[in-house]
């Protein structure tokens, strides 16, 4: 008898090379095999549970950056007046949540911010919990 | 044939709003659905393996805080003279371990320390390993 | 019917008590039960996917330390002129990758660097993905 296989874990790695002041960062998923999807510049959460979240990037100018998951809730990450980020966190997310950026720069110019090595990874930690597809 | 489901992963999120000087933090589990249990102000470990541990909180005064798992062993986290914590770690824990706080304040007063956003998350990383229930 | 068990997750904890200047750190796996293997002072990656990586250690002198996984690729961690490390990261690794250290000291002496509490943990986050054994 073949031993049971794991169903694929919900996870995604998105990249971002550009952030817009007073808006967010433009995210793209480099792989077609991701088990989570990007829609309207947000990562869509289908499965309830804890998520491991990794955020990295080097910015062309000083900015304040927050990563949100739900309107009216505090951010998953909040970084004030930084030129780079390399953070890891754990958060409980649920079906219908959407993970997205908010960015503010401190310059008078409203140019886009360029990003090197911009990467956001989400990995579900509670397979076996509720999912809605 | 129905694909196999994941058995639930051992994980828990506890909250704490108060810590007692020379003692620990009073932990409560907001959800009844947790797969791990709190007993005598400690999180009980039933399954051997690596655990992802996230610890957050904002304290009403400066304190030194340690998170222990076994008598005679070094702490999982140890923070000295802080007013907030936002840390992530990985540790190998085993059946019979108990995760609990120890707190010391540096004020002459022996008041309780109030905590905002106090949260401790443990997530088992080795399902399939030994568990004793 | 017995519920399906999890196949063991790919994970390993290695220890290192000594690093060689211009080379790497000598890693040993204290447990025979690890699901990943050490070969030629490197941790062998058999399974594609995200890995949670924890790196800790206290060094006898200041050094610069990098953790690599593939020739021609940037490091997983890179620390410059430190006497200790306590870092967590997430990275996508794949079959044929090998995780290994590179170390440089800034002293004229070419003595080995002694390490207290030197520990590197890797935990696969995408069971169910491709593995080659």
């Amino acid at each position: 008898q073949v031993p049971p296989q794991y169903p694929p874990i919900q996870s995604i790695r998105v990249q971002f090379t550009r952030c817009e002041n007073e808006k967010g960062c433009i995210i793209t998923s480099p792989s077609k095999d991701e088990t989570m999807k990007v829609q309207d510049n947000s990562i869509i959460i289908n499965c309830d549970g804890f998520y491991l979240i990794s955020l990295k990037g080097y910015f062309s100018e000083e900015l304040s950056l927050s990563l949100y998951y739900r309107k009216g809730r505090g951010p998953l990450f909040s970084l004030s007046k930084v030129t780079s980020v390399d953070s890891i966190g754990v958060a409980y997310l649920a079906f219908k949540d959407k993970v997205y950026f908010n960015v503010t720069t401190h310059s008078t110019s409203y140019k886009d911010i360029q990003v090197n090595g911009g990467e956001l990874i989400l990995i579900h930690q509670n397979p076996g919990g509720f999912c809605a597809y | 044939q129905v694909p196999p489901q994941y058995p639930p992963i051992q994980s828990i999120r506890v909250q704490f709003t108060r810590c007692e000087n020379e003692k620990g933090c009073i932990i409560t589990s907001p959800s009844k659905d947790e797969t791990m249990k709190v007993q005598d102000n400690s999180i009980i470990i039933n399954c051997d393996g690596f655990y992802l541990i996230s610890l957050k909180g904002y304290f009403s005064e400066e304190l030194s805080l340690s998170l222990y798992y076994r008598k005679g062993r070094g702490p999982l986290f140890s923070l000295s003279k802080v007013t907030s914590v936002d840390s992530i770690g990985v540790a190998y824990l085993a059946f019979k371990d108990k995760v609990y706080f120890n707190v010391t304040t540096h004020s002459t007063s022996y008041k309780d320390i109030q905590v905002n956003g106090g949260e401790l998350i443990l997530i088992h990383q080795n399902p399939g390993g030994f568990c004793a229930y | 019917q017995v519920p399906p068990q999890y196949p063991p997750i790919q994970s390993i904890r290695v220890q290192f008590t000594r690093c060689e200047n211009e080379k790497g750190c000598i890693i040993t796996s204290p447990s025979k039960d690890e699901t990943m293997k050490v070969q030629d002072n490197s941790i062998i990656i058999n399974c594609d996917g995200f890995y949670l990586i924890s790196l800790k250690g206290y060094f006898s002198e200041e050094l610069s330390l990098s953790l690599y996984y593939r020739k021609g690729r940037g490091p997983l961690f890179s620390l410059s002129k430190v006497t200790s490390v306590d870092s967590i990261g997430v990275a996508y690794l794949a079959f044929k990758d090998k995780v290994y250290f590179n170390v440089t000291t800034h002293s004229t002496s070419y003595k080995d660097i002694q390490v207290n509490g030197g520990e590197l943990i890797l935990i696969h986050q995408n069971p169910g993905g491709f593995c080659a054994y």
Epitope: S66, G74, P75, L76, F77, S78, S80, K81 | T17, R18, K56, Y58, S60, E61, E62, T83, S84, D86, S107, S109, K111, D112, Q114, V115, N116, G117, G118 | -
Partner: antibody, heavy 118, light 106 residues
Framework: EVKLVESGGDLVKPEGSLRLSCVVS????????MSWVRQAPGKGLQWVAY????????SYTDAVQGRFTISSDNAKNTLYLQMNSLTTEDTAVYYC???????????WGQGTLVTVSS | SYVLTQLPSKNVTLKQPAHITCGGD??????VHWYQQKLGQAPVLIIY???SRPTGIPERFSGANSGNTATLTISGALAEDEADYYC?????????FGGGTHLTVL
């Protein structure tokens, strides 16, 4: 000199919305928790909401939970209170206050008046 | 939720001591802060951590806290001390104020 200046108070109809702002200066905004405290006409002080220094943690008094949202923008040194589904019971002067050690309120703004009436 | 009880009003003769109390279950285990609010003005922190005075607050203001009662004392009340006084603690991720005591200086 520490200064907190509230704005955004107005006359609004029941079930309406309002957003209050509090611009701070004289201290490093991103290092301190902040709160909103209100005072109904002729009544005592009532704590409304708290937000941590990094904006990641917040809490509310039961009376406003689910209707009010506290937020901050460290880039702009500004604290906000988004108030939805307002009722006449929300009529008050709203103060923003900086948290000190022991979670006291060591600096206050002068307040902004919110009137909910049809 | 935690409740702090204050008497609504208190009279004191000029230059005499005034004692304003704040009752709460085992309040002695908590840090109590006191605020003064004059008519038409924002509150001002006058005592923190039970008995400490911020810079600029006159020495006639002092505080104590034990058992189920915290006390604010004005050693010799002046006309300018006529105001509302509020006690405050933090409990279970929420701030709690007493109902306030209006002090009248006669």
């Amino acid at each position: 000199e520490v200064k907190l200046v509230e704005s955004g108070g107005d006359l609004v109809k029941p079930e309406g919305s309002l957003r209050l702002s509090c611009v701070v200066s004289g201290f490093t905004f991103s290092r301190y928790g902040m709160s909103w405290v209100r005072q109904a006409p002729g009544k005592g002080l009532q704590w409304v909401a708290y937000i941590s220094s990094d904006g990641r943690s917040s809490s509310y008094t039961d009376a406003v939970q689910g209707r009010f949202t506290i937020s901050s923008d460290n880039a702009k040194n500004t604290l906000y209170l988004q108030m939805n589904s307002l009722t006449t019971e929300d009529t008050a002067v709203y103060y923003c206050a900086k948290l000190g050690r022991g979670f006291n309120f060591n600096f206050w703004g002068q307040g902004t008046l919110v009137t909910v009436s049809s | 939720s935690y409740v702090l009880t204050q008497l609504p009003s208190k009279n004191v003769t000029l230059k005499q001591p005034a004692h304003i109390t704040c009752g709460g279950d085992n309040i002695g285990s908590k840090s109590v802060h006191w605020y003064q609010q004059k008519l038409g003005q924002a509150p001002v922190l006058i005592i923190y951590y039970d008995s400490s005075r911020p810079t600029g607050i006159p020495e006639r203001f002092s505080g104590a806290n034990s058992g189920n009662t915290a006390t604010l004392t004005i050693s010799g009340a002046l006309a300018e001390d006529e105001a509302d006084y509020y006690c405050q603690v933090w409990d279970s991720s929420a701030s709690v104020f007493g109902g306030g005591t209006h002090l009248t200086v006669l």
